[in-house]
Interface confidence: medium
């Protein structure tokens, strides 16, 4: 199996009640605007075939996509939460910048690409859905990277 290196986040990143609450509130606000409840971006299909030792690397890819393609373009929405949560997630992304997999990561890229394609296909509602799943992103990072 591919070996992941530097794919760790300190537990303290997830022990800050204020930013945790703001992240979850942002997700809630966005999910209220999400009419497509049948589609789940961060779910079984994303994790399929990816072992737990590779999961942090997978979530890093999802985090980076979410920041660059969703949160930055939508940064004027869902205030005041967005202006606090985006820098926090960007710091997590920066801390995972040296997280790599030695070996073939095609199976991971394939799963991430499906998530990206779904968001793109849904257009703005896909971006809203991705923001509405920030709680899942947060918890999946916590579960995989500590």
């Amino acid at each position: 199996a591919p070996i992941s290196s530097h794919c760790r986040l300190d537990k303290s990143n997830f022990q800050q009640p204020y930013i945790t609450n703001r992240t979850f509130m942002l997700a809630k606000e966005a999910s209220l605007a999400d009419n497509n409840t049948d589609v789940r971006l961060i779910g079984e299909k994303l994790f399929h075939g990816v072992s737990m030792s590779e999961r942090c690397y997978l979530m890093k890819q999802v985090l980076n996509f979410t920041l660059e393609e969703v949160l930055f373009p939508q940064s004027d929405r869902f205030q005041p939460y967005m202006q606090e949560v985006v820098p926090f997630l960007a710091r997590l992304s920066n801390r995972l910048s040296t997280c790599h997999i030695e070996g073939d990561d095609l199976h991971i890229q394939r799963n991430v690409q499906k998530l990206k394609d779904t968001v793109k296909k849904l257009g703005e509602s896909g971006e809203i859905k991705a923001i509405g799943e920030l709680d899942l992103l947060f918890m999946s990072l916590r579960n995989a990277c500590i």
Epitope: K11, E44, F47, M52, R55, I146
Partner: antibody, heavy 121, light 110 residues
Framework: EVQLVESGGGVVRPGGSLRLSCAAS????????MNWVRQAPGKGLEWVSG????????DYAASVKGRFTISRDNAKNSLYLQMNSLRAEDTALYYC??????????????WGRGTLVTVSS | QAVLTQPSSVSGSPGQSITISCTGA?????????VSWYQQHPGKTPKLIIY???KRPSGVSNRFSGSKSGNTASLTISGLQAEDESDYYC??????????FGGGTKVTVL
């Protein structure tokens, strides 16, 4: 076939300790978060504690925090619950439960048959 | 003490539809889509029948459906059958990284 087999239950006096074990088989143990859920006789379900795949995060219900410790040994495909300072209200059937899919540590898709803990003087 | 509130009992005749409610707070059911439902027959282990508010695990009858509005989640059983007589529990994940359950609802098929 997924199998979860709990052991270690028994009768203990208030203030005493017990260590529960859960032997897992039929799946890649370290791909899943694991949990303990309890059910007092004739009562409803109560989540007790959960641990992520590598033991890095351990979460507890407020009612057991500071008294119970969850741990896992991936090499032995085993989950544990160390219970200290036991109280009468801890009397229950303790279930070992696995996430429904690998990313869902909060949905309990597979359950053991449970091990009974009785706290009585 | 259950954190989520469910009716203690609900009954219906065979073929009917029944709905079980599960009321939480803004920090659990109201905030996130991490609601699940479990069926538990007497003397048996619980069985996951709904997750992600409205998704069914493979093998679970499509007579079971879930939904959520505000702080209240609901489980609907359509075409009620004798084997549906059981206890049902709702559950939600929370922002404090804990899981909360409802007190359970006993479903009786008349």
């Amino acid at each position: 076939e997924v199998q979860l087999v709990e052991s270690g239950g028994g009768v203990v006096r208030p203030g005493g300790s017990l260590r529960l074990s859960c032997a897992a088989s039929g799946f890649t143990f370290d791909d899943y978060g694991m949990n303990w859920v309890r059910q007092a006789p004739g009562k409803g379900l109560e989540w007790v504690s959960g641990v992520n795949w590598n033991g890095g995060t351990r979460d507890y219900a407020a009612s057991v925090k500071g008294r119970f410790t969850i741990s896992r040994d991936n090499a032995k495909n085993s989950l544990y619950l160390q219970m200290n300072s036991l109280r009468a209200e801890d009397t229950a059937l303790y279930y070992c439960a696995r996430g429904w899919y690998s990313g869902s540590f909060y949905y309990f898709g597979y359950w053991g048959r449970g091990t009974l803990v009785t706290v009585s003087s | 003490q259950a954190v989520l509130t469910q009716p203690s009992s609900v009954s219906g005749s065979p073929g009917q539809s029944i709905t079980i409610s599960c009321t939480g707070a803004s920090g659990d059911v109201g905030a996130y889509n991490f609601v699940s439902w479990y069926q538990q027959h007497p003397g048996k282990t619980p069985k996951l029948i709904i997750y992600d508010v409205n998704k069914r695990p493979s093998g679970v009858s499509n007579r079971f459906s879930g939904s959520k509005s505000g702080n209240t989640a609901s489980l609907t059983i359509s075409g009620l059958q004798a084997e549906d007589e059981s206890d049902y529990y709702c559950s939600s994940y929370t922002s404090t990284f804990s899981v909360v359950f409802g007190g359970g609802t006993k479903v009786t098929v008349l």
